[in-house]
């Protein structure tokens, strides 16, 4: 699997999940955020060559086509698989509020 | 939605879907299928800006943050939402099958 | 219920100014990111200029030095001044306020038009 554990491991040039830290006031400029300051979003890169991880037998036979004809700019891209929720704590006013936002931090990459 | 009634109709740059035929004898070396030659399987490209057509709230942050850091090597990527799937006939020896083949044709995009 | 009004457009010579507001209400306006996107006849609606709730800003190329965007949170508007305008500045503009939380709003739109 094109996760965490196997990519953060090994430095893999083709499809997978690659650590990326983002600042909620520095990086995306949202100070209403009270915690966490920022968290591991991560993000998915990398070429996609034939039966990696290919999401359906469109990104199949698309990594197919790609590979016997290379100066087709058609090919499948590497995206998030498994996302898990982020936990946040924010103010309306003086009133605190616990949020989950889901699908926040990529644990997985396919090729799709 | 940036499906096949609006991408084929406009030229778009962004994130949509565009026309790709595949032969399944020239393109993919399949010489086992019999019916059709090939199909539309079409495919997904363009950039994903700001809100664009964004798949999580993942893509979402990922899109904001390539905004405001655009020497970011991080952004979501086009890749096909909906499929349909495609009928073909082949042999096994002398005996005709009549296989259906799960999500071969993009019908529209989306931003992940 | 959230509205998004925006106000400005009009009729402007090529090298003109317009300033453009949008007044939003129903929000809890100081967590939104606000943008302004534009539509042209015939082209898809693209971003122009955005301000995220911390004031952190970015701009089309097509704008950049001339476009500034800024925000009031005490009067929940956004604006948009439009300096050395060009003829491929016309086109409706739209108010856009984003929360990650909630759904995305959008304004009715502004015509610009930039023409002599």
């Known amino acids: 699997a094109l996760d965490t554990n196997y990519c953060f491991r090994n430095l893999e040039e083709n499809c997978c999940v690659r650590p990326l830290y983002i600042d909620f006031r520095q990086d995306l400029g949202w100070k209403w955020v009270h915690e966490p300051k920022g968290y591991y979003a991560n993000f998915c890169s990398g070429p996609c060559p034939y039966l990696r991880s290919a999401d359906t037998t469109h990104s199949t036979v698309l990594g197919l086509y790609n590979t016997l004809n290379p100066e087709a700019s058609a090919s499948p891209c590497c995206v998030p698989q498994d996302l898990e929720p982020l936990t946040i704590l924010y103010y309306v006013g003086r009133t605190p509020k616990v949020e989950q936002l889901s699908n926040m931090v990529v644990k997985s990459c396919k090729c799709s | 939605a940036l499906d096949t009634n609006y991408c084929f109709r406009n030229l778009e740059e962004n994130c949509c879907v565009r026309p790709l035929y595949i032969d399944f004898r020239q393109d993919l070396g399949w010489k086992w299928v019999h019916e059709p030659k090939g199909y539309y399987a079409n495919f997904c490209s363009g950039p994903c800006p700001y809100l664009r057509s964004a798949d999580t709230t993942h893509s979402t942050v990922l899109g904001l943050y390539n905004t405001l850091n655009p020497e970011a090597s991080a952004s979501p990527c086009c890749v096909p939402q909906d499929l349909e799937p495609l009928t073909i006939l082949y042999y096994v020896g002398r005996t005709p099958k009549v296989e259906q083949l799960s999500n071969m044709v993009v019908k529209s995009c989306k931003c992940s | 219920q959230v509205q998004l009004v925006e106000s400005g457009g009009g009729l402007v010579q090529p090298g003109g100014s317009l300033r453009l507001s949008c007044a939003a209400s129903?929000?809890?306006?100081?967590?939104?990111?606000m943008a302004w996107f534009r539509q042209a006849p015939e082209k898809q609606r693209e971003l122009v200029a955005l301000i995220t709730s911390g004031g952190k800003t970015a701009y089309a190329d097509s704008v950049k030095g001339r476009f500034a965007i800024s925000r009031d949170n005490a009067k929940n508007t956004v604006y948009l001044q439009m300096n050395s305008l060009k003829a491929g500045d016309t086109a409706v503009y739209y108010c856009n306020a984003h929360w990650v939380l909630t759904s995305q709003y959008w304004g009715q739109g502004t015509q610009v038009t930039v023409s002599s």
């Open positions: 129903g929000i809890t306006f100081s967590h939104y990111d």
